[in-house]
């Protein structure tokens, strides 16, 4: 199934900002041609991923959909708005064998999925049911509907330093 | 400014043991993993392991265990590495890489520490 | 452990080529891929993570491609400051490993 149609699905074009650099870089040209940039010394906390200037955090424990939204809101973070086929990719790959859930819930009176974000999803989501409100990805390569008092692990998202 | 500072370049007798350290300026070394990397003029780079700072757990490459002790003072911000029973073949470069994620690539590295082991 | 082979230690290439720089894995390891570009006597900058995300400030002639075992890093108009060595590495699993190396340089 196609996950991402080609119509408005609230994507945002990404791109990768000034924030990781050589060591000794400087605001000027390096040697070698490459742009180089202070930065600190980690762009993500501790047992975060980085990708694309944003980091990334995969729990381990399990939870609510509503407490997961709170645990990520706790770090300073949403949940994961899986919204490119790059960002989508780059979590497929370490995600693994395991259910988490992200920042894309059912809005009954609209027919429609929106991201936390309150963007539009036009893309495709599997296993819909009449109680299942909230999405997960992992496990499959699809976005999955899932019930949203169910306990899974959760995608939390937020801009690298 | 962030930096990693490495001590000097380091001349041993085979047989001796060396210590190595990376001292971080910029940020705190409890909020990430130090990585050390040996690397060679003319072979690859081979990674020996990690430390957490805050706790002190070591994660490396078993054909690296006996030869290599990786530790860390957070009071100093800095990471060693020491390695034992020197032989030619640990004439290297040791660099220490930062990483605060589990899917580890490199984006930073110190500037390295040349050891050279020789009679 | 997973071996990661770069099969040709030398490639010569001219100033405005494309080369392609290969690199295998002894097992699948999804997209976990790193590039690296070594000049003598300085550190590694990483070029590519996750296979093919260009890091911040790597010039986009520098390309890379492939998922499971099969990765290749693509410079193409080659210029003169690209002649390097560039090292693959995988972060699958521990203990992460390295490609021996590809050395580029001017034919």
């Known amino acids: 199934p196609q996950i991402f149609n080609k119509s408005n699905d609230g994507f945002t074009t990404t791109r990768s900002y000034g924030t990781v650099s050589q060591i000794f870089g400087s605001s000027s040209p390096s040697p070698n041609g490459f742009i180089t940039t202070r930065s600190y010394g980690t762009v993500c906390p501790k047992d975060w991923e980085f990708y694309q200037a944003r980091c990334f955090f995969l729990s381990t424990s399990e939870s609510s959909w509503n407490e997961s939204r709170d645990f990520c809101k706790g770090k300073g973070s949403t949940l994961a708005i899986v919204n490119t086929p790059e960002k989508l990719k780059f979590l497929q790959d370490i995600t693994d064998a395991e259910k988490y859930f992200i920042g894309l819930i059912y809005h009954r009176e609209e027919k429609r999925w929106r991201w936390i974000n309150n963007s539009v999803f036009n893309g495709n989501v599997t296993n819909q049911n009449q109680n299942f409100n909230c999405a997960t990805i992992g496990l499959t390569k699809t976005f999955d509907a899932a019930s949203c008092d169910i306990s899974y692990r959760r995608i939390c998202e937020k801009n690298a330093k | 400014e962030v930096q990693m500072q490495q001590s000097g370049a380091e001349l041993v007798k085979p047989g001796a043991s060396v210590k190595l350290s990376c001292t971080a300026s910029?940020?705190?070394?409890?909020?990430?993993?130090m990585h050390w990397v040996k690397q060679r003029p003319e072979q690859g780079l081979e990674w020996i392991g990690r430390?957490?700072?805050?706790?002190?757990?070591?994660k490396s490459d078993p054909k690296f265990q006996g030869k290599a002790t990786i530790t860390a003072d957070t009071s100093s911000n800095t990471a060693y590495l020491q390695l034992n029973s020197l032989t030619s073949e640990d004439t290297a470069v040791y660099s220490c890489?930062?990483?605060?994620?589990?899917?580890?690539?490199?984006?930073?590295w110190g500037q390295g520490t040349l050891v050279t082991v020789s009679a | 452990d997973i071996v990661m082979t770069q099969s040709h230690k030398f490639m010569s290439t001219s100033v405005g080529d494309r080369v392609n720089i290969t690199c295998k894995a002894s097992?699948?390891?999804?997209?976990?891929v790193a590039w690296y570009q070594r000049k003598p006597g300085k550190s590694p900058q990483v070029l590519i993570y996750?296979?093919?995300t260009r890091h911040t400030g790597v010039p986009d002639r520098f390309t890379g491609s492939g998922s499971g075992t099969d990765f290749t890093l693509t410079i193409s108009n080659v210029q003169s400051e690209d002649l390097a060595d560039y090292f693959c590495q995988q972060y699958r699993s521990y203990p992460l490993t390295f490609g021996a190396g590809t050395k580029l340089e001017l034919k």
């Open positions: 996750w296979a093919s």
């Open positions: 890489a930062p990483y605060s994620g589990n899917y580890v690539w490199f984006p930073y």
């Open positions: 097992q699948d390891v999804g997209t976990a």
């Open positions: 910029g940020f705190n070394i409890k909020d990430t993993y």
């Open positions: 430390i957490d700072p805050a706790n002190g757990i070591t």
